[in-house]
Interface confidence: medium
Amino acid sequence: AGLKLMGAPVKLTVSQGQPVKLNCSVEGMEEPDIQWVKDGAVVQNLDQLYIPVSEQHWIGFLSLKSVERSDAGRYWCQVEDGGETEISQPVWLTVEGVPFFTVEPKDLAVPPNAPFQLSCEAVGPPEPVTIVWWRGTTKIGGPAPSPSVLNVTGVTQSTMFSCEAHNLKGLASSRTATVHLQALPAAPFNITVTKLSSSNASVAWMPGADGRALLQSCTVQVTQAPGGWEVLAVVVPVPPFTCLLRDLVPATNYSLRVRCANALGPSPYADWVPFQTKGLAPASAPQNLHAIRTDSGLILEWEEVIPEAPLEGPLGPYKLSWVQDNGTQDELTVEGTRANLTGWDPQKDLIVRVCVSNAVGCGPWSQPLVVSSHDRAGQQGPPHSRTSW
């Protein structure tokens, strides 16, 4: 079979947006299966037409309605003949147009008067491509060959830059890059003490505007009264915007404030946020827990717990816990040092414990008291029925 590309030179140059019809003539075959190939890959679409001119002469057309850069490449047609693939002479399709940007100036954030660079690159065909830079609406410098780097000594306010690429087909304008001025960050906000214990506090906050420079750290300052002596200053890397304050004094009023810093310096401090650490849980267990059987039930008594330290705060109420070996159990909260226990089975052994609580929680449990089911009911006074151990 004789294959040839018709009506097209070995090199075909077309302007972007123009139509192209590549024609391929096949002679010497009755029913050729003509395939178009671009850069080694079969063109898998229906923009193709095959016309029988005579029994052994066919013309295949590949139609491109509006060529763009991606259509440029090496085209040929091929047919299968007796198990062998015959290919035509290739045609190189070049698509010319206004320059195409491969690199455009990017937005930047820079410190005042600091030098910086912007880059611009555009390609043809046709070459050569020259670059002209614009600062706002003012052209800066003469045409330079692509690629071009613009060196700027510094700016004192936000400024816009763009580049323009020229070739024989015309000009193309790049995106406009905005060069922003960096500034000190704004103060943080929404400062919250998220968790409190007697000696620790977790703090979280939202960063203010970063001043177009990455926030590097935040400082949490703690005092015992707003404007008082600094108790603690913690510098934390960010993100996350959280901090754990350790080794605080229980049941104490504190205030904290936060500021954050970028490369240019720190933000103003946010307003003071007051908080109070929790007091300590009671340190002592109630002593001398004992039981008195009565006709109506069981009376439990113990000695009052006196606070060991002011940080424990006021004590009370007491919490009583009892359990029986039949699985029955319960808890009771009482204000004094005496409790009347009901709802227990006198035929089973009873184990009782008591603790004293405050605003923080319950202190240690007392030694357990075992009230044996073998104790005689209603016995009041004899030592063996008033047992504490």
């Epitope: 003539s25 139609s63 309605k65």
Partner: antibody
């Protein structure tokens, strides 16, 4: 003269199978593509797919892929459209279309088409 | 899947110019074809490759394409031009054809 003769109207129940045909004459069957086009009552045209008689290469529209089969018999110059299981929504007129082009001087193709008269398929229980 | 959008109807008086549009994202790269279908008849190819008139079609029919819009123009519409008109083009992938929804032309 180019002619496309389509099989007659048919009434089927849902779930039935059906094959309709389009017999070509007046040209070399293997030289051209034949398309099938659907037109539901009172509605627009829908391209279903096409086959090239020469190599029985087929292409389908996304809505019809897997629902119908397009085939051709070179010996009788006939193209076929086949359903394995008809649905009421397949009720429509089905046209076969021959795509063609000719050249004057070998470089500018002039495009033309021939349409068959259509086959009315009614699917109803 | 790819779609071509046409106005459902267009009305003109005899002798006036009728314009029927067809929009599709792939039309900047793919050719538009136009069909005329009169009531009870098979469609007829009127325009191919955006602007080429099919053999036997009167000169008052013309086609154009710009960007994502193809247009069929009938200059000096006649009563016999009353019909449904369909645009037809390749999908953006180039792997299947699509018809527009059709436009009913009324010549009052």
């Amino acid at each position: 003269e180019v002619q496309l003769v389509q099989s007659g109207a048919d009434v089927k129940k849902p779930g039935a199978s059906l094959t309709i045909s389009c017999q070509a004459s007046g040209y070399t069957f293997t030289d051209y593509w034949i398309s099938w086009v659907r037109q539901k009552p009172g509605k627009g045209l829908e391209w279903m797919g096409q086959i090239r008689g020469q190599h029985s290469s087929t292409l389908y529209g996304p809505s019809f892929q897997g629902h119908v089969t397009i085939s051709a018999d070179r010996s009788t110059a006939t193209a076929y459209l086949q359903w394995r299981s008809l649905e009421a929504s397949d009720t429509a007129m089905y046209y076969c279309v021959r795509h063609g082009a000719s050249t004057s001087g070998g470089t500018i193709p002039e495009y033309y088409q021939h349409w068959g008269p259509g086959t009315l398929v009614t699917v109803s229980s | 899947s790819y779609e071509l959008t046409q106005p459902p109807s267009v009305s003109v008086s005899p002798g006036q110019t009728a314009r029927i549009t067809c929009s599709g994202d792939a039309l900047p790269k793919k050719y538009a074809y136009w069909y005329q279908q009169k009531s009870g008849q098979a469609p007829v190819l009127v325009i191919y490759e955006d602007a080429k008139r099919s053999s036997g079609i009167p000169e008052r029919f013309s086609g154009s394409s710009s960007g994502t819009m193809a247009t069929l123009t009938i200059s000096g519409a006649q009563v016999e031009d009353e019909a449904d008109y369909y645009c037809y083009s390749l999908s953006d992938s180039g792997n299947y054809f699509v018809f527009g929804g059709g436009t009913k032309l009324t010549v009052l």
